[in-house]
Interface confidence: low
């Protein structure tokens, strides 16, 4: 049989951040290679990562076509000796389908992790500070341009700002559904800032990790009386 000694893939896992999406699985191949297929619930299967010895496959190009669709992937285990026969065929020399394992369903819009945000700048004018969050580019395209996280999520995406006096540990918070905060500060005090991306309407993966802390008196800041 053409599928003798092949081991079905297992632990199929989606790893996705800001729509950069990779399917991972086990085990590392010994006498076999892998081919991955992906489809939407109603679509046709499309093959990716032909005859790979990797245990991961970057499926970003497929899922960004419509991030609101639900996708399913499957990983075929192809006997090593059959992998070089036909051009891009999954079937062994006897024509049988190699063993495969299905992934969990994956809906990028609802499940992709929010990447760690970055504070782009902060500017103090008197007792007010304007903090700007970098609008990170995704790999989702429209009209041949890459959309930002804000473009894709619209009002579903908010940012939470944590800020505190450098001399104390008491944190305050502010929220915005844009990429800017305007907060009141005490004159003459230095403050530190950290932001977090949040999608309140989600049930899973609602929050990003906190951004790196930025403090007044560092390069990103600007002060004007």
């Amino acid at each position: 049989s053409g599928t003798t000694n092949t081991v079905a893939a297992y632990n199929l896992t989606w790893k996705s951040t800001n729509f950069k999406t990779i399917l991972e699985w086990e085990p590392k191949p010994v006498n076999q290679v892998y081919t991955v297929q992906i489809s939407t619930k109603s679509g046709d299967w499309k093959s990716k990562c032909f005859y790979t010895t990797d245990t991961e496959c970057d499926l970003t190009d497929e899922i960004v076509k419509d991030v609101k669709q639900t996708y399913l992937a499957r990983v075929f285990s192809v006997p090593w000796r059959n992998s070089t026969h036909g051009k891009e065929t999954l079937f062994g020399t006897h024509g049988e389908e190699p063993p495969y394992e299905n992934s969990p369903e994956f809906t990028p819009y609802l499940e992709t992790n929010l990447g760690q945000p970055t504070i782009q700048s902060f500017e103090q004018v008197g007792t007010k500070v304007n903090v700007t969050v970098e609008d990170e580019r995704t790999l989702v395209r429209r009209n041949n341009t890459f959309l930002s996280l804000r473009d894709v999520f619209g009002k579903d995406l908010i940012y939470t700002l944590y800020y505190w006096k450098s001399s104390s540990s008491g944190k305050k918070t502010a929220k915005t559904n844009t990429n800017e905060f305007l907060i009141d500060v005490d004159k003459g005090e230095n403050y530190c800032f950290s932001v977090q991306a949040v999608i309140p309407s989600r049930t899973v993966n609602r929050k990003s990790t906190d951004s790196p802390v930025e403090c007044m008196g560092q390069e990103k800041g600007e002060f004007r009386e």
Partner: antibody, heavy 125, light 108 residues
Framework: QVQLQESGPGLVKPSQTLSLTCTVS?????????WSWIRQHPGKGLEWIGE???????RYNPSLKSRVTISVDTSKNQFSLKLSSVTAADTAVYYC??????????????????WGKGTTVTVSS | EIVLTQSPGTLSLSPGERATLSCRAS???????LAWYQQKPGQAPRLLIY???SRATGIPDRFSGSGSGTDFTLTISRLEPEDFAVYYC?????????FGGGTKVEIK
């Protein structure tokens, strides 16, 4: 075809709480839209009060935030507005509206495509 | 708060004429969030244009929108009798969502 209908008392006494309900018919309130309240003072322009997502997350106009509560009841397909400590300045026509996220080619457009007919609320003793 | 300034306040024109209404924002607005509405006396506003330039369902093609950033325009190519009304622009991207003060298009 989705329709919205505002209901509630047309007369409210000063310092009391104005309470209005918007009933959604012809569609589900849980279908992924935002639901807004807007008001229009007599002979004036339009003022956005706030909005709610079916999950319960809200956004309010900062100028009214301390007095406004918007809530949703998905079982009744309704959302509601409460405005506390009203004065004569809150006399207006109150509209509810659907704020639709239209998803196209990877991103969103937003607009208020369905409106209720409006209900007049007068604040007077 | 993003302030939307509409001009002119009143536009006096005859049926068949072209109407050009302006909406200027105090800061840049993504076209995804810019809409135009028509309101007639005693009625709720009616969506005309969304995304700055896309016509809503059922809106005649004599209505068109254009612009980006801080300057947006609503054009009615040939005014019909039913087009005389008040027109509002609106942004729904930045809280608080705001409307322009309106432009009244009246019969000359």
């Amino acid at each position: 075809q989705v329709q919205l209908q505002e209901s509630g008392p047309g007369l409210v006494k000063p310092s009391q709480t104005l309470s209005l309900t918007c009933t959604v018919s012809g569609g589900s309130i849980s279908s992924g839209q935002y639901w807004s309240w807007i008001r229009q003072h007599p002979g004036k322009g339009l003022e956005w009060i706030g909005e709610i997502y079916y999950s319960g997350s809200t956004r309010y106009n900062p100028s009214l935030k301390s007095r406004v509560t918007i809530s949703v009841d998905t079982s009744k397909n309704q959302f509601s507005l409460k405005l506390s400590s009203v004065t004569a300045a809150d006399t207006a026509v109150y509209y509810c509206a659907r704020d639709t996220p239209y998803y196209y080619d990877g991103g969103y457009y937003y607009y208020m495509d369905v409106w209720g007919k409006g209900t007049t609320v007068t604040v007077s003793s | 708060e993003i302030v939307l300034t509409q001009s002119p306040g009143t536009l006096s024109l005859s049926p068949g004429e072209r109407a050009t209404l302006s909406c200027r924002a105090s800061q840049s607005v993504s076209s995804s969030y810019l809409a135009w509405y028509q309101q007639k006396p005693g009625q709720a506003p009616r969506l005309l244009i969304y995304g700055a330039s896309s016509r809503a369902t059922g809106i005649p093609d004599r209505f068109s929108g254009s612009g980006s950033g801080t300057d947006f325009t609503l054009t009615i190519s040939r005014l019909e009798p039913e087009d005389f009304a008040v027109y509002y622009c609106q942004q729904v991207g930045v809280v608080p969502y705001t409307f322009g003060g309106g432009t009244k298009v009246e019969i000359k």
